[in-house]
């Protein structure tokens, strides 16, 4: 099932998935001056079965001749660097497809693709956070978020990560102000069924890849 919301935003951090579950959509977004062809695919879809998954549909961008009738707010360089979705300078392929059945790898870039990728994730997807360059991590727990199904609604767990500027004098991790979870309650208080498909396999992979997950993108 598709997750209702996007993963949580952590100030000065970006997130990344190591592999994408079947049913994940990647929107066909184009860089400035280009647009998705009118009758082209809206998104690529991770599809397949438990033994083999791949991305369906092709994204195609064409030169944008349409006049701009929207009021544009151009992000400042700092904002662009900290956009929450993965920036695709070089697509990372950390996981061999065979090692995560029912998952797709990072799809290759397409011509004139936008600088950030917009995914629609599905229940059970895990994403990993890292502070952007110039900020360091204060951990209180795992810097990851999982889309879970609780009481028939989807929600993302709150990653336990705070990114602080290198020059700032930071508090000890124990003194940090806790970041409010959207639900405002710890998971232990919920007693109904939580869908946890594929968490374990991804967590195990995370343990071996945690140190190298972002190296190809943020050097």
């Amino acid at each position: 099932e598709l997750c209702d919301d996007d993963p949580p935003e952590i100030p000065h951090a970006t997130f990344k998935a190591m592999a994408y579950k079947e049913g994940t959509m990647l929107n066909c977004e184009c860089k400035r001056g280009f647009r998705r062809i009118k009758s082209g695919s809206l998104y690529m879809l991770c599809t397949g079965n438990s033994s083999h998954s791949s991305w369906d549909n092709q994204c195609q961008c064409t030169s944008s001749a349409t006049r701009n009738t929207t009021k544009q707010v151009t992000p400042q360089p700092e904002e662009q660097k900290e956009r929450k979705t993965t920036e695709m300078q070089s697509p990372m392929q950390p996981v061999d497809q065979a090692s995560l059945p029912g998952h797709c790898r990072e799809p290759p870039p397409w011509e004139n693709e936008a600088t950030e990728r917009i995914y629609h994730f599905v229940v059970g997807q895990m994403v990993y956070y890292q502070c952007v360059q110039g900020y360091r991590a204060l951990h209180r727990g795992p810097a990851e978020s999982v889309c879970k199904m609780t009481h028939g609604k989807t929600r993302w767990t709150q990653p336990q990560l705070i990114c602080t500027g290198e020059m700032e004098t930071s508090q000890f991790p124990g003194e940090e102000k806790p970041q409010a979870s959207p639900e405002g309650r710890p998971e232990s208080e919920t007693s109904c069924l939580v869908t946890t498909t594929d968490f374990q396999i991804q967590t195990e992979m995370a343990a071996t890849m945690e140190t190298s997950i972002f190296t190809t993108e943020y050097q």
Epitope: L2, D4, D5, D6, G23, M25, N27, E29, C30, R32, R35, K38, S39, S41, L42, Y43, L45, T47, D56, N57, S64, T66, N68, T69, T70, Q72, V73, K84, T85, I118, H120
Partner: antibody, heavy 114, light 107 residues
Framework: QVQLQQSGAELVRPGTSVKMSCKAA????????IGWVKQRPGHGLEWIGD????????DYNEKFTGKATLTADTSSSTAYMQLSSLTSEDSAIYYC???????WGQGTLVTVSA | DVVMTQSQKFMSTSVGDRVSVTCKAS??????VAWYQQKPGQSPKALIY???YRYSGVPDRFTGSGSGTDFTLTISNVQSEDLAEYFC?????????FGGGTKLEIK
């Protein structure tokens, strides 16, 4: 929570125009196109067009070219649709839709009557 | 434009039954098909995307299938709250088009 909140019902005169709004909340407005759909009893659902607030481009169903004008204001995360030269054929419920069809607004009822 | 045909305007079923709503496209649309449920006085609710994938909060008794030109929405173990109109939509080519709808009546 992702929401699309549409403006209230409109009773308008033939020949005039009307502008309705769709305010997005709970997601990054500039990341997703917003589409508009017309529903009239006995005529089903019709796609009017869509606008990408981030990319700034707009597509119209040819049937609605000249009838509908789509705009968006990124500062208020609001999309707008203006309908001009209204006739009784334009009496309908109009929906905005976003996030790859997953989210629909509650609809705006437009009644064209003298 | 691609024409989406839902040949059955009305379907009658009983609670606990299994029912299939069909939709035929006038040309190949791949799997770029969505299904919606609309209850009286409400806006359409997205059920299925890419012909067979469920949106969040959609009970697993709703399943979509098909590709190319023939598509089916199956509701197994029909519940009284499934009383609604069901629409298919193609988004393979512009303008995106909808089927005329199938009203599900509960006996």
């Amino acid at each position: 929570q992702v929401q699309l909140q549409q403006s209230g019902a409109e009773l308008v005169r033939p020949g005039t125009s009307v502008k309705m709004s769709c305010k997005a909340a709970g997601y990054t407005f500039t990341n997703y196109w917003i589409g508009w759909v017309k529903q009239r009893p006995g005529h089903g659902l019709e796609w009017i067009g869509d606008i990408h607030p981030g990319g700034g481009y707009i597509d119209y169903n040819e049937k609605f070219t000249g009838k509908a004008t789509l705009t968006a204001d990124t500062s208020s995360s609001t999309a707008y649709m203006q309908l001009s030269s209204l006739t009784s054929e334009d009496s309908a419920i109009y929906y905005c839709v976003s996030r790859n069809f997953a989210k629909w607004g509650q609809g705006t009822l437009v009644t064209v009557s003298a | 434009d691609v024409v989406m045909t839902q040949s059955q305007k009305f379907m009658s079923t009983s609670v606990g039954d299994r029912v299939s709503v069909t939709c035929k496209a006038s040309q190949n649309v791949g799997t770029n098909v969505a299904w919606y449920q609309q209850k009286p006085g409400q806006s359409p609710k997205a059920l299925i995307y890419s012909a067979s994938y469920r949106y969040s909060g959609v009970p697993d008794r709703f399943t979509g299938s098909g590709s190319g030109t023939d598509f089916t929405l199956t509701i197994s173990n029909v519940q009284s709250e499934d009383l609604a109109e069901y629409f298919c939509q193609q988004y393979n080519s512009y303008p995106y088009t909808f089927g005329g709808g199938t009203k599900l009546e509960i006996k």
